[in-house]
Structures are given as C-alpha cells and as structure tokens.
C-alpha cells in the first residue's frame, strides 16, 4: 500500500508547485482513505454475501457506531462550523477503535487495512490543529475500548462478516459527510 | 528498525523524585501511543501510566496507585516520552518499560507493539 498522504512530514512537492494548503490535505487524506475502503469492501464483498443484504436487515445490529445527525451542524440546513468539527474529531475517534478490529479481517488486503488506520489518525492530527474548541473532544476510554474489542472479537463468523461490512459501509458514509462538511468550512 | 531507549533510572530515596525518559527512533511517534510499565522481581509487568497520541481531554491515564504523584508527557518534536515519579515509596522500586501501541485500548500491556529493554528504579526506605 503506498504511504498515506501527510504521514511523512517532508512530503516531497512537484517543482513548482504550490504546497497544499491545511484544507487541500484534510481533502485528500479523506480521499485517500475512501480508496481505502472501497479495497477493503471489495474483499469483503468477495468473500461474504453480505453486500447483498438490504440495509434494514443490516440495521438490525447493536453497534454503536458514529453516525451524523442534523444537531451535529454539519448538514446545510443548521450548519455550524465549530460543533461540525467537533462532531468530525470525535467520531474519528469512536471509529478508531472498529478500525482496529478490522485489522484482523482481511487476508490479502491486510496492508490496505492497516493504510486505513493509520491514515485516520494523521487526518485526525490535521483537523486537531484546525479545531479551537479542543475541551471539547474526550479521548475514548482505553478500558471500553478493551472490552468491546473482546466482545467483536468472540461473535461467531457470519456476525464477524456482518460487523465487519457495517463497519467498513459506516465508515464510508461518515466520511463522505465530514468531506461535504469540510468543503463548506 | 523502531528503538526504544529508556533513561533516568537509579536509586533515590523515599520521598524523593525521578524523571525517566524515552526516546524513540524508526517510529510515526506523534500517531503512537505511549505507555509506561513496570515489573517488580516476581510480579507480573503493570501498566503505569500512558499518554494518548491526541491532545484532547482525557488523553493521559494512570494506575490509581501512581495517581497524583506521576506525571506522563510527551513531546512530539523530540520523539521522546517521560515519566516524572514523585514522592517515590519503595513498592515503587522496579524495572520501568517504556512502550509504543497504536491500540485504542492503550492500557492493556499485550496490545502494546515496541518495547524499550528497561530502566530500574530503586527506592530505598
């Protein structure tokens, strides 16, 4: 897998071109993830049926994962900078501890996944520099995180498949949010 | 090749203050968490303290026994953590390991990738 943009401090710019700006970065590590994911859900279509399965079918899971909502502020109806960013870090930060469980899911593209979740953790280090209301944002509590990495780590395969295609499909939207929110900003 | 090198150890006397220091080579340090732990002879390694990759609240934790006398930081531009041990008891003489995860459950020692070879720390009563 190719290093994820702005892991490396020294990126090496093109001669005479403009260095990106903080909003071009966030823009294209959103992006380079997103291509991420859509590897990760490739494999993981190929493997399982679980693509097929409608989306109230799927709906039926006890997972809490980050979603976004019209009181975030970061729909066009309501938007509001601040409480949208705010909304952004913390729940890269929630999916922080799903990327991890995936990083176990994949065989042949356990780089990719890996790419993922490192990417993730530089875009939230770039939108930390950019938020001004960082009392705002808890880090996730390490002994919760421990014990539902356990707990998804039990279930049984075809819960496995399932939780990993929620997971990857959330994500994904969560993203593409954030990505029409950022460009507002 | 990723190194962890751990400094600052010796013996000191109940009471007294330490500062250990890690520096880290090979490693995406600012996106790594980082821990420290400790093993008494005959003791099973115990967390002791970490410090979250983020700057957000709640980004250190420690083992209640150390709370309030141990202080965790880190500094991004050195690649290097530290842990300030203060008003040291002698259940606190052991050998302290510092230690990189990229986990989100950054307190558990067997979610921790890189570890440095040890520094000991010796309280004499």
């Known amino acids: 897998a190719p290093v994820p943009p702005g892991e490396d401090s020294k990126d090496v710019a093109a001669p005479h071109r403009q260095p990106l700006t903080s909003s071009e970065r966030i823009d294209k590590q959103i992006r380079y993830i997103l291509d991420g994911i859509s590897a990760l859900r490739k494999e993981t279509c190929n493997k399982s049926n679980m693509c097929e399965s409608s989306k109230e079918a799927l709906a039926e899971n006890n997972l809490n994962l980050p979603k976004m909502a019209e009181k975030d502020g970061c729909f066009q109806s309501g938007f509001n900078e601040e409480t949208c960013l705010v909304k952004i870090i913390t729940g890269l930060l929630e999916f922080e501890v799903y990327l991890e469980y995936l990083q176990n899911r994949f065989e042949s593209s356990e780089e990719q996944a890996r790419a993922v979740q490192m990417s993730t953790k530089v875009l939230i280090q770039f939108l930390q520099k950019k938020a001004k209301n960082l009392d705002a944002i808890t880090t996730p509590d390490p002994t919760t995180n421990a014990s539902l990495l356990t707990k998804l780590q039990a279930q049984n395969q075809w819960l496995q498949d399932m939780t990993t295609h929620l997971i990857l499909r959330s994500f994904k939207e969560f993203l593409q949010s954030s990505l029409r929110a950022l460009r507002q900003m | 090749e990723v190194q962890l090198v751990e400094s600052g150890g010796g013996l000191v006397q109940t009471g007294g203050s330490l500062r250990l220091s890690c520096a880290t080579s090979?490693?995406?340090?600012?996106?790594?968490?980082m821990g420290w732990f400790r093993q008494a002879p005959g003791k099973e390694r115990e967390f002791v303290a970490a410090?979250?990759?983020?700057?957000?609240?709640?980004?250190?934790y420690y083992v209640d026994s150390v709370k309030g006398r141990f202080t965790i930081s880190r500094d991004n531009a050195k690649n290097t953590v530290y842990l300030q041990m203060n008003s040291l008891k002698p259940e606190d003489s052991a050998v302290y390991y510092c230690?990189?995860?990229?986990?989100?459950?950054?307190?558990?020692?067997?979610?921790?990738?890189?570890w440095g070879q040890g520094t000991q720390v010796t309280v004499s009563s």
């Open positions: 090979g490693l995406a340090f600012s996106i790594y968490t």
């Open positions: 230690a990189a995860t990229r986990s989100t459950a950054w307190n558990s020692p067997q979610r921790y990738d890189y």
């Open positions: 410090a979250h990759w983020t700057v957000f609240r709640g980004n250190t």
